[in-house]
């Protein structure tokens, strides 16, 4: 069986997948719907998934939820949120995805994988 | 391919509201953020505001009193009104549309010039 | 409120290479993006994130982003590259907003 994901191959892939689903949208990413903001800091794969796992019945983030999940060291589940959240401020989902992908492209280029 | 063009009166009096209009063809314009950007002559680029399509703003905190702008998806169109117009609010103003994996602008219209003058 | 600073000028002769600068308070931590704008035209995104290319736009054109400075690179400058340059951030803060540098005059000599 194959072994591991090298965590560089899983962070490009992860960037990837976020520039795909923001591509030639037809319909604004999952409807408008509003997530927490989050601090961009140690910690921030886990605190993207809770902002995330929030949203439902938007298949185009499912795919980046999963692999949010792979850097995640614990389990995360709707409603949990950590004291990365910056609980004042909500924004759309195609916004936090912006913010998100700016984040971990300047983290690949500064070979920071982990 | 996206394309953008302005619309609107290239003349305005002082203390008027200017109404431009921005129509969008070629790609929907629900799935992305649109701003304004004006350029007075021989100067640089200020952005005015942006808005998507759940109506959600974000405005020039310098013009933000005079700012309106809204979005019509089943028209395809966006709006933007500056209200009490002055000479210093002379400008070719733009509309473009914000790329969908950033924070920069993928596609801007030709642009408009718009006079204030009596 | 976040500024950002170019130089109003910079001059380079066929076939060199030009550095345009764009310094703004830790600007490393943003993404900026560099637009092309000629005479009576629109501008052109030339470079997004710090260095990604749009298509179209060729391998000449580069981008670099740490520390306080950012920076357009353009190698074996042409004739046809000759236009304002403009440097641009999203500031995320509790009133977010867009901020474009000054812009900067490229001429070749």
């Known amino acids: 069986s194959p072994g591991p994901v090298p965590p560089s191959t899983a962070l490009r892939e992860l960037i990837e997948e976020l520039v795909n689903i923001t591509q030639n949208q037809k319909a604004p990413l999952c409807n408008g719907s509003m997530v927490w903001s989050i601090n961009l800091t140690a910690g921030m794969y886990c605190a993207a998934l809770e902002s995330l796992i929030n949203v439902s019945g938007c298949s185009a983030i499912e795919k980046t939820q999963r692999m949010l999940s792979g850097f995640c060291p614990h389990k995360v589940s709707a409603g949990q949120f950590s004291s990365l959240h910056v609980r004042d401020t909500k924004i759309e989902v195609a916004q936090f995805v912006k913010d998100l992908l700016l984040h971990l492209k300047k983290l690949f280029r500064e070979g920071r994988f982990n | 391919q996206v394309q953008l063009q302005e619309s609107g009166p290239g003349l305005v009096k002082p203390s008027e509201t200017l109404s431009l209009t921005c129509s969008v063809s070629?790609?929907?314009?629900?799935?992305?953020?649109w701003s304004w950007i004006r350029q007075p002559a021989g100067k640089g680029l200020e952005w005015i505001g942006r808005i998507y399509m759940t109506g959600r703003t974000n405005y020039n905190s310098s013009l933000k009193s005079r700012v309106t702008m809204s979005i019509d998806t089943s028209k395809n169109q966006l709006s933007l009104k500056l209200s009490f117009m002055t000479a210093a609010d002379t400008a070719v103003y733009y509309c473009?549309?914000?790329?969908?994996?950033?924070?920069?602008?993928?596609?801007w219209g030709q642009g408009t010039l718009v006079t204030v003058s009596s | 409120s976040y500024v950002l600073t170019q130089p109003p000028s910079v001059s380079v002769a066929p076939g060199q290479t030009a550095r345009i600068t764009c310094g703004g308070n830790n600007i490393g931590s943003k993404g900026v993006h560099w637009y092309q704008q000629k005479p009576g035209q629109a501008p052109v995104l030339v470079v997004y994130?710090?260095?990604d290319r749009p298509s179209g736009i060729p391998e000449r054109f580069s981008g670099s982003n740490s520390g306080n400075t950012a920076t357009l690179t353009i190698s074996r400058v042409e004739a046809g590259d000759e236009a304002d340059y403009y440097c641009?951030?999203?500031?995320?803060?509790?009133?977010?907003?867009?901020?474009f540098g000054g812009g900067t005059k490229l001429t070749v000599v």
């Open positions: 641009q951030v999203w500031v995320s803060s509790s009133d977010h907003h867009v901020v």
């Open positions: 070629g790609g929907s314009i629900s799935s992305y953020y």
């Open positions: 994130d710090d260095s």
């Open positions: 473009a549309r914000e790329s969908g994996s950033s924070y920069s602008y993928d596609y």
